[in-house]
């Protein structure tokens, strides 16, 4: 009762390997690394056959099929390139994930190279089977911002893409009769979050308590350049409105807030985040030059339709920007203390502007970002948010604009965004 000689499958082997096989002898068929046993269209690791009483084998020898990792998973904001010809996805094939540059960058500078493993899974040396993460690049406009050597008196038209983080925030409270509406600016921090000043998102219906506006009343416009043409802009409603819990309406201390967008916005040449600064209580150094952009929407009678569609009755149709120096804290405190009133320039604020006053201290909407170029990381960093002072008493001598010192709130911002700082390290100025 001897069974016929067995031929191992191509890329496989049989064990035990004997010259002769008799009744009740069993053979295990397995495949080389990177191959799987295929029997009746079913893949398995091994297959056992037995020599029967009548001298036949219980089954035919199966074949060995090369492992296929199949189409790799899609990467959000990323691309896949195949290293092998014909886009092979079989064992030892290589693929490379990359992020949609220059708008996204791979977390931890990962190589993005994945190899099809013997187990049929795309594997990376560092991340294993996990996909890489594409994080938005921050503080790197598609157009180079001008050098900050010369002082600009007054505003200057911004080219499209110069301030890709600039957001126009429109608040329209339809629960009021008549409808209340106002505008502010903000700065994009990620595909889903806008940083702004708390006073922009506070309902003035209450004075003794701080009440945020309802999220249903907030619309954010990104990639907007000329308010008369919103065709190229992305508009988004708000999923959440978060005011700093300690925001004080009497002195605008802790004047910082966040808006979470309903849907992440696609990044591109006109929509890119700004970087957050390091956590540092000193804030920006005195005399450093920063930029503030804004449409200067100041007319109280302008309607939302007019501002977004026609852009009439506004200070400027086109986004404007100014360069302003940071003012030493003591000098700013003194300038406000010398005026009648209980103005307090706290440690959560800094001032910018010129002693002689002028138009440059008036431009920029509330909540807009005061950005400084960080030489080390070669990125633009949001150091301040337009808070109070300048825009109220436009051009007054020695009335500096007061800005929220963002560096005091970095932890709070990350906490609200629900991202541990380590995950978003590339977003932080280094």
């Amino acid at each position: 009762n001897e069974c016929p000689e067995l031929q191992p499958p191509v890329h496989g082997k049989i064990e035990p390997s004997q010259a002769k096989y008799f009744f009740k002898d069993q053979v295990l068929v397995s495949c080389d690394t990177g191959y799987k046993v295929l029997k009746d269209n079913v893949e398995m690791d091994t297959f056992q056959i037995e020599c029967l009483k009548d001298g036949t084998w219980s089954n035919k020898i199966p074949t060995c099929k090369i492992v296929d990792c199949r189409a790799p998973g899609e990467l959000e904001h990323g691309l896949i390139t195949f290293s092998t010809r014909n886009n092979l996805t079989t064992y030892k094939s290589e693929i490379k994930y990359s992020c949609q540059e220059p708008y996204y960058k791979m977390l931890n500078n990962n190589t993005g190279i994945y190899t099809c493993s013997a187990q049929g899974v795309w594997m990376n040396k560092v991340l294993g089977r996990s996909l890489p993460t594409c994080l938005p690049e921050c503080g790197q406009p598609s157009r180079s911002l001008p050098s900050l050597v010369k002082r600009i008196i007054g505003g200057r038209n911004a080219e499209p893409g110069l301030f890709p983080w600039q957001a126009l925030i429109v608040v329209e409270d339809t629960s009021r009769v008549p409808n209340d509406k106002w505008f502010g600016s903000g700065a994009l921090l990620s595909a889903s979050w806008i940083l702004t000043a708390a006073h922009v998102l506070r309902s003035q219906r209450r004075d003794t308590t701080v009440i945020p506006v309802s999220k249903e009343h907030v619309t954010v416009y990104l990639g907007l350049h000329d308010v008369r043409d919103k065709s190229g802009a992305v508009n988004s409603s708000a999923a959440r409105v978060v005011l700093h819990p300690d925001f004080n309406i009497q002195n605008y201390n802790h004047d910082i807030a966040l808006v979470q967008l309903q849907e992440p916005v696609p990044l591109g040449p006109h929509v890119m985040p700004v970087c957050l600064p390091r956590l540092e209580p000193e804030g920006p150094a005195p005399h450093m030059l920063g930029l503030v952009a804004g449409w200067g929407i100041s007319n109280p009678n302008v309607t939302v339709d007019e501002i977004i569609s026609s852009g009439t009755r506004t200070l400027s149709d086109v986004l404007q920007y100014v360069k302003l120096p940071v003012v030493p804290h003591a000098e700013c405190k003194t300038s406000y203390e010398s005026r009648s009133g209980n103005y307090s320039v706290t440690e959560n604020m800094f001032c910018a502007g010129y002693y002689e006053g002028g138009k440059d201290t008036c431009l920029g909407d509330s909540g807009g970002a005061f950005v400084i170029f960080d030489d080390l990381s070669q990125r633009w960093v949001v150091q301040g948010l337009v808070s109070w002072g300048g825009p109220e008493e436009c051009g007054s001598k020695q009335v500096y604009g007061v800005y929220t010192k963002v560096s005091n709130y970095v932890d709070w911002v990350w906490e609200q965004m629900g991202l541990p700082q380590s995950v978003v390290e590339p977003q932080v100025e280094r």
């Epitope: 106002w182 003035q204 004075d207 003794t208 009497q250 009133g341 209980n342």
Partner: antibody, heavy 116, light 112 residues
């Protein structure tokens, strides 16, 4: 040092218009709304409405819709109350008060007398 | 509109004695935000009004602690523990919960 300084008394003829100003100082102007309150001679206080100093949007109580207009000049931190087609019953002291609802600081009042 | 009813309409008090003014609203002043926007002010003779108390019981800065406010829902009270000569004038309660804000008719306090 928070102060609301109103314009001086006015004597007007029926049918004329008057504009009362309320110069604010000592606080962040756009942080608080501004209310307007009327007090007829020897009578109590009546809230006329308020203006949002950030948006510039006014809200009027029903009795003060039509001939009464609240406006604003943020650059000089001044809200205004304008009354048109004045009637004898508009004779009153008009107060501005800081806040849409708080009314924690009050101007000294402006007496508007309407008489032929 | 919410009707605010003050009692009494006038009050004559001996210096050093306590005084109490009641203010009732025609509907609850508890707002949807959980706060009660009931305030008290004093208008001294020939002067503009001055707020004394906000959110039912919070004293404005500079207001002597002989003044206190209490109440909830529709019933509120202003108390002066020991009346002084400078306390004379008309006291008004007003609500800032329901639009339009409304004042009580005022309580005139004078010294005996």
């Amino acid at each position: 040092q928070i102060q609301l300084v109103q314009s001086g008394s006015e004597l007007k003829k029926p049918g004329a218009s008057v504009k009362v100003s309320c110069k604010a100082s000592g606080y962040i102007f756009t942080s608080y709304g501004m209310s307007w309150v009327r007090q007829a001679p020897g009578k109590g206080l009546k809230w006329m409405g308020w203006i949002n100093t950030y948006s510039g949007v006014p809200t009027y109580a029903d009795d003060f819709k039509g001939r009464f207009v609240f406006s604003l000049d943020t650059s000089v931190r001044t809200p205004y109350l304008q009354i048109s087609s004045l009637k004898a019953e508009d004779t009153a002291t008009y107060f501005c008060a800081r806040g849409g609802e708080a009314m924690d600081y009050w101007g000294q009042g402006t007496l508007v007398t309407v008489s032929s | 509109d919410v009707l605010m009813t003050q009692t009494p309409l006038s009050l004559s008090v001996t210096p050093g004695q306590p005084a109490s003014i009641s203010c009732k609203s025609s509907q609850s002043l508890l707002d949807s935000d959980g706060k009660t926007y009931l305030n008290w002010l004093l208008q001294r003779p020939g002067q503009s009004p001055k707020r004394l108390i906000y959110l039912v019981s919070k004293l404005d800065s500079g207001v002597p602690d002989r003044f206190s406010g209490s109440g909830s829902g529709t019933d509120f009270t202003l108390k002066i523990s020991r009346v002084e000569a400078e306390d004379v004038g008309v006291y008004y309660c007003w609500q800032g919960t329901h639009f339009p804000w409304t004042f009580g008719q005022g309580t005139k306090v004078e010294i005996k």
